[in-house]
């Protein structure tokens, strides 16, 4: 792992999931242990990410379970790598007018996408929904990550770094709690509410308006409960 890890100083409290969403479904970007990147219909331990903001709108995205950086090759294929290459593993982040985020390679210009087609980002373009992302706070109990949390006074510093090379377990001052709207969900179909017949709000329009509360890739914005 690089000495100057973009993840240094991160904490488990900052775990987020990037997901694409239409009125009917959502896919969470996951980085598997073998470096394969795909989408899952739900949060998984492999879709838990750390996103580090850098200067000029650049971000570095890492899967905490795979311990791999999200990177892109010259063909626009995304993959997870243990090694951080600034040219391939940094992405330009932009928020579109609809409140969704897009990430593209400054080196190769392709969009990060869960779709199979590779498309270059052009200013003002309207990318397909599988290339537009929202961020959502982690809801998976930390115990499921099955990473031993260092016990006080029982392990040396060397042991700690061996178990936690990306330093995601290091205690630090907690991040500002996310606003309540971050985890706001619409009623489920089981609820006896006026929205129960339309739990995703599809009658009121396709894409969810996510302008409110947007704070960049490390913040989270209100989301609808996609199935």
């Amino acid at each position: 792992y690089p000495n100057a890890s973009p993840l240094l100083g991160s904490s488990w409290g900052g775990l987020i999931h990037l997901y694409t969403a239409t009125a009917r479904n959502s896919y969470h970007l996951q980085i598997h242990k073998n470096g394969h990147v795909d989408g899952a219909p739900h949060q998984t331990i492999y879709s838990a990410l750390m996103i580090r903001s850098e200067d000029a709108g650049f971000v570095v995205i890492t899967g905490v379970m795979s311990r791999r950086y999200l990177c892109m090759d010259f063909r626009g294929n995304i993959f997870g790598s243990h090694y951080f290459d600034p040219e391939n593993c940094r992405f330009q982040h932009q928020t579109l007018e609809n409140g969704y985020d897009v990430y593209h390679s400054p080196q190769y210009h392709f969009l990060v996408s869960l779709g199979r087609a590779k498309r270059a980002f052009l200013p003002g373009m309207n990318p397909p929904p599988y290339s537009q992302f929202l961020s959502r706070r982690n809801e998976i109990p930390l115990i499921h990550f099955n990473t031993p949390i260092p016990r006080r006074h029982t392990q040396s510093a060397e042991d700690d770094s061996e178990r936690d090379p990306l330093n995601v377990l290091k205690p630090r001052a907690r991040m500002t709690p996310a606003p309540a709207s971050c985890s706001q969900e619409l009623p489920s179909a089981e609820d006896n509410s006026p929205m129960a017949s339309d739990p995703l709000g599809v009658v009121r329009g396709g894409r969810v308006n996510t302008h409110a509360g947007g704070t960049g890739p490390e913040g989270c914005r209100p989301f609808a409960k996609f199935i």
């Epitope: 694409t20 739900h42 498309r119 929904p129 199935i227």
Partner: antibody, heavy 117, light 106 residues
């Protein structure tokens, strides 16, 4: 290899219900949404709804709200679609189809449901 | 909901002909459009995804183009096995299908 195998043809009377099954194999069942699409004789394809295989959450086309129920059994990698209050215009071939983010890549062979008095 | 219209609704062509089918969306859907081929008594088969990407195993005589609201499926040289019905489908907000275009033998 990926396969979606559906239950056999059904003949139902108006007002009855029908439940069609779709058994998935050859992939991780919980990694892909499943859709139901129907096609009346000589007509086009009509999207009915979608089910999240892990949570069981569903979302249906407005036309079918209140009449269609989609469920799944993760232990057998099977999804089900039940259509109630059947009428003659529900006579159709019903398909399940796997979602891969940007398309439906695999489809079941179809189940013919005939509604006739 | 976004509506899709296809034209023509049917066409007659001969083997070797170049065939073009259009699909128009009622509002912009970026490149989130798919084309399927369906033969009688069979399930639809995926041909094109993301408006212009050829699905693995599909012959290169099939191609797709377009973005926004106007899309085209082209068969460069019609083969006997291509006589079928073709459907477009949008993936932008829901999963609406176009009404289909039937390609039969002239």
């Amino acid at each position: 290899q990926v396969q979606l195998v559906q239950s056999g043809a059904e003949v139902k009377k108006p007002g009855a219900s029908v439940k069609v099954s779709c058994k998935a194999s050859g992939y991780t069942f919980t990694n892909h949404y499943m859709h139901w699409v129907r096609q009346a004789p000589g007509q086009g394809l009509e999207w009915m709804g979608i089910i999240n295989p892990i949570s069981g959450s569903t979302s249906n086309a407005q036309k079918f709200q209140g009449r269609v129920t989609m469920t799944r059994d993760t232990s057998t990698s099977t999804v089900y679609m039940e259509l109630s209050s059947l009428r003659s215009e529900d006579t159709a071939v019903y398909y399940c189809a796997r979602d891969i983010v940007d398309a439906f890549d695999f489809w079941g062979q179809g189940t013919m449901v005939t509604v006739s008095s | 909901a976004i509506q899709l219209t296809q034209s023509p609704s049917s066409l007659s062509a001969s083997v070797g002909d170049r065939v073009t089918i259009t699909c128009r969306a009622s509002q912009g859907i970026s490149s989130a459009l798919v084309w399927y081929q369906q033969k009688p008594g069979k399930a639809p088969k995926l041909l094109i995804y993301d408006a212009s990407s050829l699905e693995s195993g599909v012959p290169s005589r099939f191609s797709g183009s377009g973005s926004g609201t106007d899309f085209t499926l082209t068969i460069s040289s019609l083969q006997p096995e291509d006589f079928a019905t073709y459907y477009c489908q949008q993936f932008n907000d829901e999963f609406t299908f176009g009404p289909g275009t039937k390609v039969d033998i002239k």
